[in-house]
């Protein structure tokens, strides 16, 4: 911590400007009024302060707002955000999506830090649910965000938000997460016609039950093997050879290349050899 020392004559800061970069740490502490700093936070980012100087500025804000910074200050933190600890952030009440975007921009291009994770958690909890605009924003900055949530957290995602999800946002989701997301996607896209529906639902099918796969098999969807490989094993096992053939369409030939891999291997093992032979692929049950 910086010692309390009187501000030298003529050095009292009237505004936050570039002259302050020449101040020693103790001079910043003594000569910059915390209230002035709070009202002119937007200027801080334009000034090339050292990390040590930023520590002093943070300390001043901490003293002014021991219960947590107001949103008017948070929105303009800029690079000072990188100095915040998760404990600091837990004191905040961030409600504006613009504030969230401003802070995510500071961390852009980096992995999700504990600070960012805490910020997002505070923001989402404050909103009560992960609405479409928030999800749009978060997945734009962190494509893996959705899959970093627990199944319990995903349950608060309203079906309307599913429209914001892109296929790549689901790349790292595990089966338990897709089990939660699939019913929401089914509800969100229920009014679309067959082919359009399949395009939208495809990324979520890792959470689909057998009956939905059977229904899709009647719609000439031509599911690709990559999607089939992500289906739940328990959903695939009851499908008949005829249903899998209809589900995959021309892609059925791809089963041969995947015959040693799950869930294809498990499905083959449970089919009658006579039925498998009808595919003409040389699959051995």
């Amino acid at each position: 911590e910086v010692e309390k020392t009187a501000c030298p004559s003529g050095k009292k800061a009237r505004e936050i400007d570039e002259s302050l970069i020449f101040y020693k740490k103790w001079e910043l502490e003594a000569c910059v009024d915390a209230a002035l700093l709070a009202t002119q936070m937007d200027r801080v980012n334009a000034i090339p302060f050292t990390y040590e100087q930023l520590d002093v500025l943070k300390h001043k804000l901490d003293e002014l707002y021991p219960q947590g910074y107001p949103e008017s200050v948070i929105q303009h933190l800029g690079y000072l955000f990188l100095k915040m600890s998760p404990e600091d952030i837990r004191k905040w009440n961030v409600t504006s999506l613009e504030t969230l975007k401003a802070l995510l921009e500071v961390n852009k291009g980096h992995e999700m830090s504990p600070q960012v994770a805490t910020l997002i958690d505070r923001f989402v909890k404050g909103r009560g649910q992960l609405d479409k605009d928030t999800l749009d924003t978060l997945t734009a900055f962190y494509p893996g965000y959705l899959c970093s949530l627990s199944p319990e957290e995903l349950s608060s995602v309203p079906p309307s938000s599913i429209w914001a999800v892109r296929p790549q946002d689901l790349d790292t989701c595990d089966p338990r997460q897709l089990d939660v997301l699939y019913p929401k996607a089914r509800l969100a896209f229920q009014n679309m016609n067959g082919s359009e529906y399949f395009v939208k639902i495809q990324s979520f099918l890792g959470g689909a039950p057998t009956e939905d796969l059977k229904a899709l098999s009647q719609q000439n969807v031509s599911m690709d093997l990559a999607t089939f490989m992500k289906l739940r094993t328990d959903a695939v096992l009851p499908l008949t050879v005829a249903e899998v053939q209809k589900l995959l369409g021309p892609h059925v030939e791809g089963l041969k290349a995947e015959e040693r891999h799950r869930p294809v291997r498990d499905w083959i093992l449970r089919q009658r050899q006579d039925d498998l032979d009808t595919l003409g692929l040389g699959l051995q049950g």
Epitope: D174, P175, H261, R262, L269, G285
Partner: antibody, heavy 119, light 107 residues
């Protein structure tokens, strides 16, 4: 609940065939969702999967052991068996039988039986 | 065969510590990754299946994560009964393979 019990000789001579049987109790070897595996663990070393069998008789073996392994099933006795031919000292290990439940993993194991290959 | 590489091969930790063990597959195995615990003279015990699902009866301090090639087993607060050897195992490919094991010892 399902339990597994290995049985067979604890000592086998080099070049002979190791034979073990696993008896399934509290459930059926003909379970739709299960395959039945043999796994071994040499003293002080890690686990090595040997192969599995489905009640239909379909088998799948570890490629490194395939030429010497036969796994069979007897649904009437609720048992499955392992035969490993042309054994050497390198086959000395604790041999486990295990159930591979298709929706999870090796969720039920026998207690294991130590087999020593020595003349 | 798909190679499974575990790290570290051993670690020393104290009761209450958070312990993380990693497992890397030589190619993508989707979420078909299981974790086992083995104590001396005993058969292995299934802890986590499908990368992140907790096996029935296993304490919630155990958790798993990952997909594709990189996986993690975490023990949030190590208990005396957790000192054991832990193995990962892939079941994606028909030739099942185990990791080399991680021995968790008392510091």
């Amino acid at each position: 609940q399902v339990q597994l019990q290995e049985s067979g000789p604890g000592l086998v001579k080099p070049s002979e065939t190791l034979s073990l049987t696993c008896t399934v109790s509290g459930g059926s070897v003909s379970s739709y969702y299960s395959t039945w595996s043999w796994i071994r663990q040499p003293p002080g070393k890690g686990l090595e999967w040997i192969g599995y069998i489905y009640y239909s008789g379909s088998t799948n073996y570890n490629p490194s052991l395939k030429s010497r392994v036969t796994i069979s099933v007897d649904t009437s006795k609720n048992q499955f068996s392992l035969k490993l031919s042309s054994v050497t000292a390198a086959d000395t290990a604790v041999y486990y039988c295990a159930r591979d439940f298709v929706l999870s993993g090796f969720d039920i194991w026998g207690q294991g039986t130590m087999v020593t290959v020595s003349s | 065969d798909i190679q499974m590489t575990q790290s570290p091969s051993s670690l020393s930790a104290s009761v209450g510590d958070r312990v993380t063990i990693t497992c890397r597959a030589s190619q993508s195995i989707s979420s078909y990754l299981n974790w086992y615990q083995q104590k001396p003279g005993k058969a292995p015990k299934l802890l986590i299946y499908a990368a992140s699902s907790l096996q029935s009866g296993v304490p919630s301090r155990f958790s798993g994560s990952g997909s594709g090639t990189d996986f993690t087993l975490t023990i949030s607060s190590l208990q005396p009964e957790d000192f054991a050897t832990y193995y990962c195992q892939q079941s994606y490919d028909a030739s099942y393979t185990f990791g080399g094991g991680t021995k968790v010892e008392i510091k």
